[in-house]
Interface confidence: low
């Protein structure tokens, strides 16, 4: 053995943000010839010894952190990075606005504001086409998302979600889309 078994990848298809009652597939991908996979939901006793978990209709109880590993011979791989499976549409959608407005000159500043009438303490902003929340690496934000020195790359469609830190995998429906235009 020349090194530890590399960790597999775990992905959610089509997305890790899943509207309630919609389908999602979790797929664990290791090297060819794997003897056995283990796909599990953390902080629960739920696991399966298969590489693919098909969820035909997303439920609140299925939201949470998942990870997988695989076995070759008697050896187990390092675990995959955790995948956070989020149920969306649990709460009413927030509103997303741009200050001073959705049309901004290149080099200017704009602030996207996500507002909700509920007492949520967490907000996430997504740009269409980007896999991660806006302003990675810090994952969650308050209601204001400042974009300093706007460039053409910031153009696009944005949506935000609100949720509570008490239930971090149960999110609101997405806001109506906001089109940011950089001139």
């Amino acid at each position: 053995q020349s090194g530890p078994l590399p960790k597999p990848s775990l992905q959610a298809l089509p997305s890790s943000l899943v509207p309630l009652e919609k389908p999602v597939t979790l797929r664990c991908q290791g090297p060819p010839g794997v003897d056995l996979y283990r796909l599990e939901k953390l902080s629960s006793s739920r696991y399966q010894d298969q590489a693919v978990l098909f969820i035909p209709a997303m439920k609140r109880s299925l939201a949470g952190r998942y990870r997988c590993s695989y076995q070759n011979g008697s050896l187990w791989s390092l675990p995959s990075d955790q995948l956070e499976l989020v149920a969306t549409g649990v709460f009413a959608k927030p509103s997303l606005s741009a200050q001073p407005g959705p049309a901004v000159s290149s080099g200017g500043d704009v602030t996207l504001q996500c507002q909700t009438r509920y007492g949520f303490d967490q907000f996430a902003l997504y740009k269409e086409g980007d896999p991660a929340p806006y302003k990675n690496p810090e994952r969650w934000y308050r209601a204001s998302f400042p974009i300093i020195t706007v460039t053409a790359a910031h153009s696009g469609t944005y949506r935000c979600y609100s949720f509570s830190s008490r239930d971090p995998y149960l999110w609101s429906a997405p806001s109506d889309p906001l089109e940011l235009v950089v001139t």
Epitope: K7, S43, S45, L78, P79, D81, E84, P137, E138
Partner: antibody, heavy 114, light 106 residues
Framework: EVQLLESGPGLVAPSGSLSITCTVS????????VNWVRQPPGKGLEWLGM???????DYQSTLKSRLSISKDNSKSQVFLKMNSLRTDDTARYYC????????WGLGTSVTVSS | DIQMTQSPSSLSASVGGRVTITCKAS??????IAWYQHKPGKGPSLLIH???TLQPGVPSRFSGSGSGRDYSFSISNLQPEDIATYYC????????FGGGTKLEIK
């Protein structure tokens, strides 16, 4: 070759803040997480928190309000920031790769004292 | 948070002998336990992950077993270079170290 190297201030005043940098080589921060662990003098190892490849973070619950972990993927650097320091934060601080922690730095010693 | 109770806190054994260290988790950790060797002036070294999988280059004198909440780590044919402090680590939900076991040679 995988390597992690911690660098810190050495001495910090009580109620001050601590900033430590972990510079990594031999792997990409987009594909691996990095943990922070400390060891007070004469005591055991204590996990502080972790930043994942995608940038999300986990923290030990008792330290969550005082800790912040961030990174700069392009510079292969991970940053630990801790505020409201107390004398019992005196420890050797280590960074270590991913889950479980398969590679470690040698650590940097931090003393909290006036 | 998951707690890990490691015992004993110290032990002494003879060269060629065998020692066993145990860790008990406060809840089922589904075999997500690792064992580390820590020598003064160095960073800890990962010996075993996922209960029993040895890291490359780690001698087969080291072994691990267990399930549920109860886990053990053993060193057989003890060597002078095994003098160190050993820690268990659960990584089922966040991470928690055991308190450590300081191993001395008689």
């Amino acid at each position: 070759e995988v390597q992690l190297l911690e660098s810190g201030p050495g001495l910090v005043a009580p109620s001050g803040s601590l900033s430590i940098t972990c510079t990594v080589s031999g792997f990409s921060l987009t594909g691996y997480g990095v943990n922070w662990v400390r060891q007070p003098p004469g005591k055991g190892l204590e996990w502080l928190g972790m930043i994942w490849g995608d940038g999300s973070t986990d923290y030990q619950s008792t330290l969550k309000s005082r800790l912040s972990i961030s990174k700069d993927n392009s510079k292969s650097q991970v940053f630990l920031k801790m505020n409201s320091l107390r004398t019992d934060d005196t420890a050797r601080y280590y960074c270590a790769r991913d889950l479980p922690m398969d590679y470690w730095g040698l650590g940097t010693s931090v003393t909290v004292s006036s | 948070d998951i707690q890990m109770t490691q015992s004993p806190s110290s032990l002494s054994a003879s060269v060629g002998g065998r020692v066993t260290i145990t860790c008990k988790a406060s809840q089922d950790i589904n075999k997500y336990i690792a064992w580390y060797q820590h020598k003064p002036g160095k960073g800890p070294s990962l010996l075993i992950h996922y209960t029993s999988t040895l890291q490359p280059g780690v001698p087969s004198r080291f072994s691990g077993s267990g399930s549920g909440r109860d886990y053990s780590f053993s060193i057989s044919n003890l060597q002078p270079e095994d003098i160190a402090t050993y820690y268990c680590l659960q990584y089922a939900n966040l991470l928690t170290f055991g308190g450590g076991t300081k191993l001395e040679i008689k």
